[in-house]
């Protein structure tokens, strides 16, 4: 039997081609030159190597480039990127948006892996800022990426990127992030008609101010309770009972089940009890009839 470290006669790879898919792992190790592999990386993705075979090719590249791969190799990694560890990726210096796109394409349609997260981090740090082109690329591949950014970083997100965002992508956004994203969404969807606009803007409403909620209440939108419960408390408090009734439409009955939770609880405390009674839901905790409500913040502003 041939010594496993020696390449069998006639099997030395002259180029990276499909004949190599029928090589055993030890044959790949023995018969493929690392420098040849590096110069023909663009061919690897077109060849259906198994992931075990890709491990062998990765090992060859690791030996050739112990300090990290050059971008000319990184750009053509293709499925070999899936075999990289975050530690491998931290050695890279990725500056080209085309390289980033090529690697994100490999993982397209799947959750952001630790490799991808590390790659994005390396790329953004290398660029020094989150420019429009980078954000367009990242939100196109990972709309949920928005919620991993700070409000300061989000301020540079172009409204055009908002179109790619799905409701579930905002699940992890906190109110401070939605405060930044909402005006962008409002701008992005401004030319849509009422019902279509509401469908698109709905998941961003956690950043909406009172005046926008008042405006929506005039448009028969029938907001569901789940959306209502995610609204900013300070934006809900000034709404009248009539406005909330119009905003929720048939879903207004759901207020009863949520009367002990924010923002419903705090909103109830601000309403006159007779106004709440008009809903016929048995909501309790409003301001009793005959009591005078002083708005101390207004009084302070006047003095």
């Amino acid at each position: 039997e041939v010594e496993k470290t020696a390449c069998p006669s006639g099997k030395k790879a002259r180029e990276i081609d499909e004949s190599l898919i029928f090589y055993k792992k030890w044959e790949l190790e023995a018969c493929v030159d690392a420098a040849l592999l590096a110069t023909q990386m663009d061919r690897v993705n077109a060849i259906p190597f198994t992931y075990e075979q890709l491990d062998v090719l990765k090992h060859k590249l690791d030996e050739l480039y112990p300090q990290g791969y050059p971008e000319s190799v990184i750009q053509h990694l293709g499925y070999l990127f899936l075999k990289m560890s975050p530690e491998d990726i931290r050695k890279w210096n990725v500056t080209s948006l085309e390289t980033l796109k090529a690697l994100l394409e490999v993982n397209k349609g799947h959750e952001m892996s630790p490799q991808v997260a590390t790659l994005i981090d390396r790329f953004v740090k290398g660029r020094g800022q989150l420019d429009k082109d980078t954000l367009d690329t990242l939100t196109a591949f990972y709309p949920g990426y928005l919620c991993s950014l700070s409000p300061e970083e989000l301020s540079s997100v172009p409204p055009s990127s908002i179109w790619a965002v799905r409701p579930q992508d905002l699940d992890t956004c906190d109110p401070r992030q939605l405060d930044v994203l909402y005006p962008k969404a409002r701008l992005a969807f401004q030319n849509m008609n009422g019902s279509e606009y509401f469908v698109k803007i709905q998941s961003f409403l956690g950043g909406a101010p009172t005046e926008d909620l008042k405006a929506l209440s005039q448009q028969n939108v029938s907001m569901d309770l789940a959306t209502f419960m995610k609204l900013r408390t300070d934006a809900v408090l000034p709404l009248t009972v009539a406005e909330v009734q119009k905003l929720l439409g048939p879903h207004v009955e759901g207020l009863k089940a949520e009367e002990r939770h924010r923002p419903v609880r705090d909103w109830i405390l601000r309403q006159r009890q007779d106004d709440l009674d008009t809903l016929g839901l048995g909501l309790q905790g409003g301001i009793p009839n005959g009591y005078l409500v002083l708005d101390l913040s207004m009084q302070e502003a006047l003095s």
Epitope: I47, P48, T50, Y51, E52, Y79, L82, K83, V106, N107, G109, H110, E111, S113
Partner: nanobody
Framework: QVQLVESGGGVVQPGGSLRLSCAAS????????MRWVRQAPGKGLEWVSV??????YYADAVKGRFTISRDNSKNTLYLQMNSLRAEDTAVYYC???????????WGQGTLVTVSS
Amino acid sequence: QVQLVESGGGVVQPGGSLRLSCAASGSTFSIRAMRWVRQAPGKGLEWVSVIYGSSTYYADAVKGRFTISRDNSKNTLYLQMNSLRAEDTAVYYCNADTIGTARDYWGQGTLVTVSS
């Protein structure tokens, strides 16, 4: 996860034909490539054929005799084996790998015996 189940193996005379099937289920949308791999008695694994997108590949030993195909609507991989020889006797395994998880999946195998 992807589950693979092979069928169609059996005993056949030299020169005869068999058609193997491999039914895939689970996260089939993420499959990147599918393969037929065989293991003859007392030997190691040998790649037989691969289908990758619309491209097909064959080991020299089966070229011109075996045909790999895939029916995406049925999530099934096939191997049509003609002009069978005694040296084709082996357990034939279906293999698939997926994008995202970068994992290989294997079926349980189906035995093909070529004997007169």
